[in-house]
C-alpha cells in the first residue's frame, strides 16, 4: 500500500465555446480507495474553486456548464488524488476555451451523382455546419474535410474543402458503392470526429435527368 500515483490531465475540450469538459487519467491507486478532485483558478484571480460537476461527462471528468465557462480567461487546472497514505497532484494545465473547441461533426450530408455537359460524371457532396455553430456572425468559422472510399478499398481519400460546404468528386468508378463522411474544425480548435457515414452507388449507365 502506498500513496496514489500522480494523475495526468488528459485533455479539455469544448463543443461550442459555451461549455467545456476536462478528463484525467488516474495514476496508480496505491492499492487503496482513492478520491480525485479537480480544482481550478483563473489567471489573475486569487480564488481557487473545485469542479462544479463530476457527473455529466462520465468518470474521471469535470464538466463546466455555461455558468462556469469564460472565454476571455485562462483556466489553471489541477487534479488531486488522495488516499489514506497520502496525496499527489497533477501538473497544472493552462486552458483557454477559445483554443480547445472540438465541434460536433457537420450535419445533413447529401450525396448526388451528377453529370457535366461533356458527360463526365461526378459525385456532388453537400453538408451543413454543425447545429451549434453560429457561422454567420463569425463566432465560429469552420473548415471542412470530406473523406470517401469505395466499399472494396482499404484507404480513405481525403479532400480539404476550406470553408466551402460542398465538393465535387470526379474520377469515380461506375458500378462501385462509395462511402462518404465529413468533419470540421474551427479556426483555433480541433477536428471533430468524422460524421455519420453515407453511401451511394455510381450507376453503370448514368444518363442526365432533366
Amino acid at each position: 500500500q502506498s500513496p496514489p500515483g500522480k494523475p495526468e490531465i488528459h485533455k479539455c475540450r469544448s463543443p461550442d465555446k459555451e461549455t467545456f469538459t476536462c478528463w484525467w487519467n488516474p495514476g496508480s491507486d496505491g492499492g487503496l480507495p482513492t478520491n480525485y478532485s479537480l480544482t481550478y483558478s483563473k489567471e489573475g484571480e486569487k480564488n481557487t474553486y473545485e469542479c462544479p460537476d463530476y457527473k455529466t461527462s462520465g468518470p474521471n471528468s469535470c464538466f463546466f456548464s455555461k455558468q462556469y465557462t469564460s472565454i476571455w480567461k485562462i483556466y489553471i487546472i489541477t487534479v488531486n488524488a488522495t488516499n489514506e497514505m497520502g496525496s499527489s497532484t497533477s501538473d497544472p494545465l493552462y486552458v483557454d476555451v477559445t483554443y480547445i473547441v472540438e465541434p460536433e461533426p457537420p450535419r445533413n450530408l447529401t450525396l448526388e451523382v451528377k453529370q457535366l455537359k461533356d458527360k463526365k460524371t461526378y459525385l456532388w457532396v453537400k453538408w451543413l455546419p454543425p447545429t451549434i455553430t453560429d457561422v454567420k456572425t463569425g463566432w465560429f468559422t469552420m473548415e471542412y474535410e470530406i473523406r470517401l472510399k469505395s466499399e472494396e478499398a482499404d484507404e480513405w481519400e481525403i479532400h480539404f474543402t476550406g470553408h466551402q460546404t460542398q465538393f465535387k468528386v470526379f474520377d469515380l468508378y461506375p458500378g462501385q458503392k462509395y462511402l462518404v463522411q465529413t468533419r470540421c474544425k474551427p479556426d483555433h480548435g480541433y477536428w471533430s470526429r468524422w460524421g455519420q457515414e453515407k453511401s451511394i452507388e455510381i450507376p453503370n449507365d448514368f444518363t442526365l435527368k432533366d
Partner: antibody, heavy 120, light 107 residues
C-alpha cells in the same frame, strides 16, 4: 472574362499599415475563395491566406496571422488585405488570386500584383 | 507545414527540346499539386492542378504526373514563350506552400 484588378503601388514608412484592394469581375464573387500571395524581390511565392466571401471564413499561414488581415466587401466584389507594423521584410509584390471553385488551394486567375515598398 | 522541394533550380534548354522539372513533397499530398509559370514582372499562371489536369487554355505540350510525394512537369517541344520560372504548389490543406522555383532559360 474573369479579372482581378489590384490597387496601385505603395511606398510606406516602417511601422505603418497598408491596405491593398482586389476588385473581382466576370464571375460570381461569393462562389470562389480569394487567396493572397507574397513574392519578395527575386524570390519564390509565399501563401499568406485566403478568404471565402460566401461566409467570410478565413484561413491563414501562421507566419502571417498577426501581420495580415483579410476582408471582403461583397457589394463591390472587392477583397482587401491589410498588412500592419510594416518593416523592410514586408517589401514585396502582393498578389490576390482566385481559388478554383472546387479545389480550394489552386489559383486559376491572378491579379497583376501590388508592389509595396517599406522605406523611411 | 508541408515542404515542397523543387529541382533543378535552373536549367538551360533549346527550342524544340523536352524538359522535365520535379517536385517532392515532405509528406503525402495525394494528387493535390499545382504547377504555375511566371514571366518577369507578371503574375503566375496556372498550368496544371490535381497533379495532371491541364488548366483551361494550356497547350498540350505541357503534362503533369506523379502522386503521393513525387511529381513532375514535362514540357515537350519547347517553344520560345515557355521560357520563364516554374513553381509547384501543394493544394492539399492549409497552409498551402510553393516550391522554390525553377528558372528555365534559352540555351
Amino acid at each position: 472574362e474573369v479579372q482581378l484588378q489590384q490597387s496601385g503601388p505603395e511606398l510606406v514608412k516602417p511601422g505603418a499599415s497598408v491596405k491593398i484592394s482586389c476588385k473581382a469581375s466576370g464571375y460570381t464573387f461569393t462562389d470562389y475563395n480569394i487567396h493572397w500571395v507574397k513574392q519578395s524581390h527575386g524570390k519564390s511565392l509565399e501563401w499568406i491566406g485566403y478568404i471565402y466571401p460566401n461566409n467570410d471564413g478565413t484561413g491563414y499561414n501562421q507566419k502571417f496571422k498577426s501581420k495580415a488581415t483579410l476582408t471582403v466587401d461583397n457589394s463591390s466584389s472587392t477583397a482587401y488585405m491589410e498588412v500592419r507594423s510594416l518593416t523592410s521584410e514586408d517589401s514585396a509584390v502582393y498578389y490576390c488570386a482566385r481559388g478554383d471553385g472546387n479545389y480550394v488551394g489552386d489559383m486559376d486567375y491572378w491579379g497583376q500584383g501590388t508592389s509595396v515598398t517599406v522605406s523611411s | 507545414d508541408i515542404q515542397m522541394t523543387q529541382s533543378p533550380a535552373s536549367l538551360s534548354a533549346s527550342v524544340g527540346e523536352t524538359v522535365t522539372i520535379t517536385c517532392r513533397a515532405s509528406e503525402n499530398i495525394y494528387s493535390y499539386l499545382a504547377w504555375y509559370q511566371q514571366k518577369q514582372g507578371k503574375p503566375p499562371q496556372l498550368l496544371v492542378y490535381n497533379a495532371k489536369t491541364l488548366a483551361e487554355g494550356v497547350p498540350s505540350r505541357f503534362s503533369g504526373g506523379g502522386s503521393g510525394t513525387q511529381f513532375s512537369l514535362k514540357i515537350n517541344s519547347l517553344q520560345p514563350e515557355d521560357f520563364g520560372s516554374y513553381y509547384c504548389q501543394h493544394h492539399y490543406a492549409t497552409p498551402f506552400t510553393f516550391g522554390s522555383g525553377t528558372k528555365l532559360e534559352i540555351k
